[in-house]
């Protein structure tokens, strides 16, 4: 960057090189060039010469003043016009940054996705700071008082093998940058209470011809957790409002859930689960589409993006890919 150049003088910023966005700042340039009494001192921001708010302080020093500086980053350098020199002589340069102190981190959440071997902690960092902001995640055992700290720029994955102070912990997040430091409230966790079961996946759907046609959704999870509660939500793709069905589930076999749906309508389904009585849910599964047949039943080979119709007794939809859910991060 600009800071690596060889200087023939000195450039500095008041109040500091990193300052709060919107502040008034002064940039000072002091020449120390052999055999040169500068006729004029020039300031450049991002390579463009500044024309206004420059004050000559003495023979070797000038000041550039900015009101309400709002740029997150700028490269400043200054030059001197020396007698008998055809070109301007470079004095020095500096990268400057403006931004905000961190907000208090809130909504600290820690979960263990089954089989991951990690505890994943996330938080709401608040408003954008524009400057380098680091987060320290503190994990303190309520049983041994031992504390581990993890330095990160965003979320953190902590190996569950490193959590050797029992099952109960306090977790909190400290945010710090050049403009300030803030700290979250402490979150109390029990490792057994924050496990999110292995993802539930809808594998296929079929509509069976009966007096009243019914649609069966087949879904499963690789979880080893015994007591699991799940929700399946579904709606016609033209609707805004979801219908929700609740299940107490035992995943020793593939689940079959029955729905009585309107004919000849494209529906979308999603499922999510949690360990019964615990706090955190899985994110909703990928969107699964199924179109119900007209009153005369028909068959589809897949109804994910493309609907291919054949005559027959059932309509089946098979999950062949993944579409991103509309709110995958919904774990609370």
């Amino acid at each position: 960057g600009i800071t690596n150049i060889n200087c023939s003088g000195h450039i500095w910023v008041e109040p500091a090189t990193i300052f709060k966005m919107g502040m008034n700042i002064s940039i000072y340039c002091q020449a120390a060039i052999k055999n040169c009494q500068p006729r004029k001192l020039h300031f450049y921001k991002n390579g463009i010469k500044e024309r206004f708010q420059i004050t000559r302080i003495n023979k070797t020093t000038a000041r550039l003043w900015y009101k309400n500086f709002l740029e997150p980053h700028a490269s400043m350098y200054c030059t001197a016009e020396c007698p008998k020199h055809f070109q301007e002589t470079l004095i020095c340069g500096k990268d400057i940054s403006s931004g905000y102190p961190p907000d208090i981190p809130d909504e600290v959440t820690c979960v263990i996705y089954e089989y991951s071997g990690n505890m994943t902690c996330t938080w709401n960092a608040g408003k954008l700071t524009y400057i380098d902001t680091k987060y320290v995640v503190h994990v303190k055992s309520l049983e041994t008082e031992e504390e581990q700290q993890y330095l990160t720029s965003s979320y953190i994955n902590i190996s569950t093998d490193s959590l050797q102070g029992g099952k109960k912990y306090l977790v909190w997040v400290q945010a710090a940058n050049a403009l300030g430091m803030e700290e979250s409230k402490q979150l109390q966790i029990h490792l057994d209470d924050i496990v999110i079961p292995s993802a539930a996946v809808i594998s296929r759907a079929e509509t069976i011809n009966a007096t009243v046609p019914k649609t069966i959704i087949y879904w499963d999870s690789q979880t080893t957790i015994e007591k699991v509660s799940c929700e399946m939500r579904y709606k016609a793709t033209t609707n805004q409002t979801w219908n929700v069905k609740e299940f107490d589930t035992n995943f020793t076999y593939v689940q079959q859930s029955e729905f009585y749906l309107e004919p000849n309508i494209k529906y979308v389904f999603q499922v999510r689960c949690q360990e019964t009585g615990k706090r955190y849910w899985q994110p909703w599964s990928s969107l699964f589409f199924h179109k119900t047949p007209e009153t005369v039943p028909q068959v589809t080979s897949k109804a994910f993006q493309h609907d291919t119709w054949n005559s027959g007794l059932t309509v089946a939809s098979i999950s062949t890919g993944h579409l991103t859910s509309d709110n995958r991060g919904d774990i609370g």
Partner: antibody, heavy 121, light 112 residues
Framework: QVQLVQSGAEVKKPGSSVKVSCKAS?????????MCWVRQAPGQGLEWMGC?????????YYANWAKGRVTITADESTSTAYMELSSLRSEDTAVYYC????????????WGQGTLVTVSS | DIQMTQSPSSLSASVGDRVTITCQAS??????LAWYQQKPGKAPKLLIY???KLAAGVPSRFSGSGSGTDFTLTISSLQPEDFATYYC??????????????FGQGTKVEIK
């Protein structure tokens, strides 16, 4: 068994700085640990100054009153912690202790012998 | 800012007496509290940590209790060597930017 050996007594002028060292033996420097500093003015109670956390990264924490005046550092190569106090005033006359449990807990099983710092013109 | 308030500031007692010192935190510190004994000219000595756990080598007449905000140090039968000053200390977290002191003001136990 952790042992903490502090530098000797100091007499300082107001406005100057003092740097007290604390050499630790018996700490596993591959593990996480806190090293903290506590002072005690004559006839007064214990006053926490700050701590340094040494682990996968280094973090320092200071009492509100000590911010900007106290700097705590650690040199892992010599197993030594330092506490520097600047802009000394007469009310900084106290015995300064380093303290740790040799791990990442904040209670102190082990204390240095104390360093008397006298601030006088 | 967690503040630690210790009471009483001093007390007079006789050998064999049961002595109780209390410490109150201005916010929940769970069981993260330690008690120290200090004699004149000496460094403090850890007695109790995690509110109720006895440090190595500390006689069983010392005990600690409490959690959250209210804590107690009890000496069941005061011995001559127990006349000293006692301090509580919160050991929850020091990373909070606003901490002033983590110790209580101290309780001096004197001979009646």
């Amino acid at each position: 068994q952790v042992q903490l050996v502090q530098s000797g007594a100091e007499v300082k002028k107001p406005g100057s700085s003092v740097k007290v060292s604390c050499k630790a033996s018996g700490i596993d420097f591959n593990s996480n640990y806190y090293m903290c500093w506590v002072r005690q003015a004559p006839g007064q109670g214990l006053e926490w100054m700050g701590c340094i956390y040494v682990g996968s990264h280094v973090n320092t924490y200071y009492a509100n009153w000590a911010k900007g005046r106290v700097t705590i550092t650690a040199d892992e190569s010599t197993s030594t912690a330092y506490m520097e106090l600047s802009s000394l005033r007469s009310e900084d006359t106290a015995v300064y202790y380093c303290a740790t449990s040799g791990s990442s807990v904040l209670y102190f099983k082990f204390w240095g012998q104390g360093t008397l710092v006298t601030v006088s013109s | 800012d967690i503040q630690m308030t210790q009471s009483p500031s001093s007390l007079s007692a006789s050998v064999g007496d049961r002595v109780t010192i209390t410490c109150q935190a201005s916010e929940n510190i769970y069981s993260f509290l330690a008690w120290y004994q200090q004699k004149p000219g000496k460094a403090p000595k850890l007695l109790i940590y995690s509110a109720s756990k006895l440090a190595a080598g500390v006689p069983s007449r010392f005990s600690g209790s409490g959690s959250g905000t209210d804590f107690t140090l009890t000496i069941s039968s005061l011995q001559p060597e127990d006349f000293a000053t006692y301090y509580c200390q919160q050991t929850n977290r020091y990373s909070n930017p606003d901490i002033y002191n983590v110790f209580g003001q101290g309780t001096k136990v004197e001979i009646k």
